[in-house]
């Protein structure tokens, strides 16, 4: 593979890596954040960064409760320089083929180039083409939302069903949930799982006369998606007099395989494409976001793009010391590789963001779950944190116990919007939510020592059970409000955090070979399930499971 973007094989070869190891041993592992605050009255001032969005709204990123000091930050920035993170970043923004194993550009950033500045891939300025797709999305979404687009019986569309999986599902699901406040004209439903229950339960609640299906599969060959799409089509035809001419009014394709789309029966005028430089997990900004535009309206979808574009501008233009996503990525490397942390918790204190951790799980783990570097050698260091999360305060009543008192270091991001879309009961709910957001980060940092526990009346063997070690790192992300622009910015922030991690680990964050093997084996086994013969071609466990399944099916 082409490795012209980096001149090192392993991050451990970099001088700053060794330097950080020494710093970790001499001060990192014993550093007390509580003491750092006592030593430096300006710590918060120095370690919080405020991002200003294109619309003037702000997001504050507070890194001050992390296990770092000036020297550690300086060494981490040195590591970023030695790993040439900015070089790889600039190559990405120039449309170079930084996805070396697939020889592709990584250009999701071009999808949110609302300034329409020239952006080139292989000598082609793709800005006019991106703009043209958005015009198509605007026109189509406005026709559907206004009722100008009608179903085969002349009724307006009331429901949209997006059928896709992975990147063709997770992004739109998360964004439509997060921006539910901005909806109102249409209902959206998402079908992803091959489990027949998913499509069956969805079809129970929609009316064929007023439903629009979006089939989201770039190649139009994704097994789960096409199976679900055919089931939806068969259901639709069975309810509408088996007239294939009605399909055109009720199905659109988010795909570039014109031949298969036409074969399916979809009018190719209702085909929304995107290029090979858009990876699935980065595709919510593309035509894959059509369900979002339909749900919240095109103008809000464009604000979502502009919020991400504003973070792109920050990431490309801000010096390393103040570069918010870069710092986020460096902290992740610091915990992962020097503290041995294996996880990363993202807890949104916001019910609208309940699918945000699931979205970030794919973004982070599919990108950086790699063990071979751009130099084609296996890493001798940990990569790819296990990202997890749930909305708080729910999470406080489940896994936060382990975060506070468990044996593992779990670096955590807490996210809150100061202004609620639902400030009910004179903002009582919002104040309770916010108090927990502040309290959890404080509690994780300050902990509670034996002395305090005893002062509160605990005695004997109960004392150690009530001790909190503290010094557990959090990054607090405080937005003004969860708007389309804010959400776009938050996603782009995590995209560039993920990019920074991958650049330092020198892995290709833009392929996903790990999804292939299971798919291939599933095809083989699929054929074996079609007959009644006893299976003996696999290992004893797999044979045993298949045969028991066949007996019970």
């Amino acid at each position: 593979s082409n490795n012209s973007f980096t001149n090192f094989k392993l991050a451990t070869e970099l001088p700053a890596w060794s330097k950080l190891q020494k710093i970790y041993e001499s001060q990192g592992k014993t550093l007390s954040v509580k003491q750092e605050f006592q030593k430096d009255a300006k710590r918060f001032e120095k370690l919080n960064k405020t991002f200003t969005n294109y619309d003037g709204s702000k997001i504050l990123f507070d890194y001050s409760k992390n296990l770092v000091n000036d020297e550690i930050i300086a060494a981490l920035i040195e590591l970023a320089k030695e790993a040439n993170v900015t070089g790889l970043r600039d190559a990405m923004f120039k449309g170079e083929h930084i996805n070396s194993t697939e020889d592709r550009a990584v250009y999701h950033v071009a999808l949110r180039n609302r300034a329409n500045k020239p952006m080139y891939v292989d000598g082609v300025n793709v800005a006019p083409e991106v703009d043209s797709v958005l015009k198509h999305m605007k026109e189509f979404s406005e026709q559907v939302r206004s009722g100008e687009w009608k179903g085969y019986t002349g009724k307006k569309i009331t429901d949209v069903v997006n059928i896709g999986i992975g990147g063709s599902d997770l992004g739109p699901v998360m964004v439509t949930e997060a921006l539910k406040h901005y909806a109102g004209v249409l209902d959206v439903h998402f079908v992803s799982n091959i489990d027949g229950t998913h499509i069956a339960e969805t079809l129970k609640v929609v009316d064929p006369e007023t439903t629009l299906f979006l089939i989201a599969s770039k190649t139009f060959t994704t097994a789960e998606t096409i199976t679900n799409a055919n089931t939806a089509k068969n259901w639709f035809l069975s309810k509408t007099g088996n007239d294939p001419s009605h399909i055109a009014k009720h199905f659109a394709a988010l795909s570039t395989n014109e031949t298969e789309v036409a074969k399916f029966g979809i009018d190719t005028k209702n085909m929304f494409g995107f290029e090979s430089w858009v990876g699935g997990r980065y595709s919510v900004w593309s035509a894959i976001g059509l369900s979002v535009a339909l749900y919240i309206g095109y103008d809000n979808f464009e604000a979502f793009l502009k919020g991400a574009e504003a973070v792109d501008n920050h990431f490309t233009q801000t010096p390393l010391e103040d570069n918010i996503p870069l710092l986020g990525g460096l902290l992740s490397v610091w915990y992962n590789n020097f503290f041995g942390a294996q996880t990363h918790l993202v807890a949104p204190f916001d019910q609208y963001l309940h699918r945000f951790p699931a979205y970030l799980q794919q973004l982070s783990m599919e990108s950086n779950g790699k063990s071979v570097t751009r130099g084609n050698v296996f890493t001798d260091y940990s990569t790819g944190s296990i990202l997890f999360g749930e909305p708080a305060t729910n999470a406080q009543h489940s896994f936060f116990q382990l975060v506070h008192q468990g044996t593992k270091l779990i670096p955590s991001d807490f996210i809150l919007a100061a202004q609620s879309h639902n400030p009910i009961e004179n903002k009582l709910h919002q104040k309770m939510l916010a108090s927990n957001f502040f309290a959890q980060a404080e509690a994780l940092m300050v902990g509670k020592d034996e002395e305090q526990v005893k002062a509160e009346g605990a005695t004997g063997g109960l004392v150690p059970h009530k001790v909190f070690s503290g010094n557990r790192p959090t990054t607090s992300i405080l937005a003004q409000k969860i708007t389309p622009a804010t959400l776009g910015a938050l996603i782009a922030y995590y995209e560039h955090v993920t990019f920074t991690e991958g650049a330092i680990w020198n892995i290709n964050s833009f392929d996903q070979w790990g999804v292939e093997l299971g798919k291939v084996l599933a095809k083989v086994i699929g054929k074996e399930l079609d007959n009644s013969s006893t299976i003996s071609t696999h290992d004893a466990s797999t044979n045993g499971l298949i045969n028991q399944f066949k007996e019970w099916m």
Epitope: E129, D131, V133, L134, H136, T256, E258, E275
Partner: nanobody, 118 residues
């Protein structure tokens, strides 16, 4: 910048053949429906043939069975094979690129002259 450059035109006798080529640069060629149009003196520009991103073709009635449109995505080129040419095929032939997945994104070539005369 975007360029569509036609070539292959010329003078040919009735019943003869010509092959027009249109080389595109500066566009994501595989994402465009490519078409040939023609304009005879004093007449409007008419569609001759087009080919979609997936290779589906469409022809004007007057050229069906005589003309064949094809594309080579690796070479960013679209072709028009013209057989059994007639004097009424005399015109300037233009190449057109229409972005298949969007709206309002169309490019034209400068045209190449085809003259069918004995």
């Amino acid at each position: 910048q975007v360029q569509l450059v036609e070539s292959g035109g010329g003078l040919v006798q009735p019943g003869g053949s010509l092959r027009l080529s249109c080389a595109a640069s500066g566009i994501s060629f595989g994402s465009y429906t490519m078409a040939w149009y023609r304009q005879a003196p004093g007449k409007q520009r008419d569609m001759v043939a087009d080919i979609t991103t997936g290779g589906r073709t469409n022809y004007a009635d007057s050229v069906k069975g005589r003309f064949t449109i094809s594309r080579d995505n690796a070479k960013n080129t679209v072709y028009l094979q013209m057989n059994s040419l007639k004097s009424e095929d005399t015109a300037v032939y233009y190449c057109k690129a229409d972005f298949a997945y969007g709206r309002d994104l169309t490019y034209w070539g400068q045209g190449t002259q085809v003259t069918v005369s004995s």
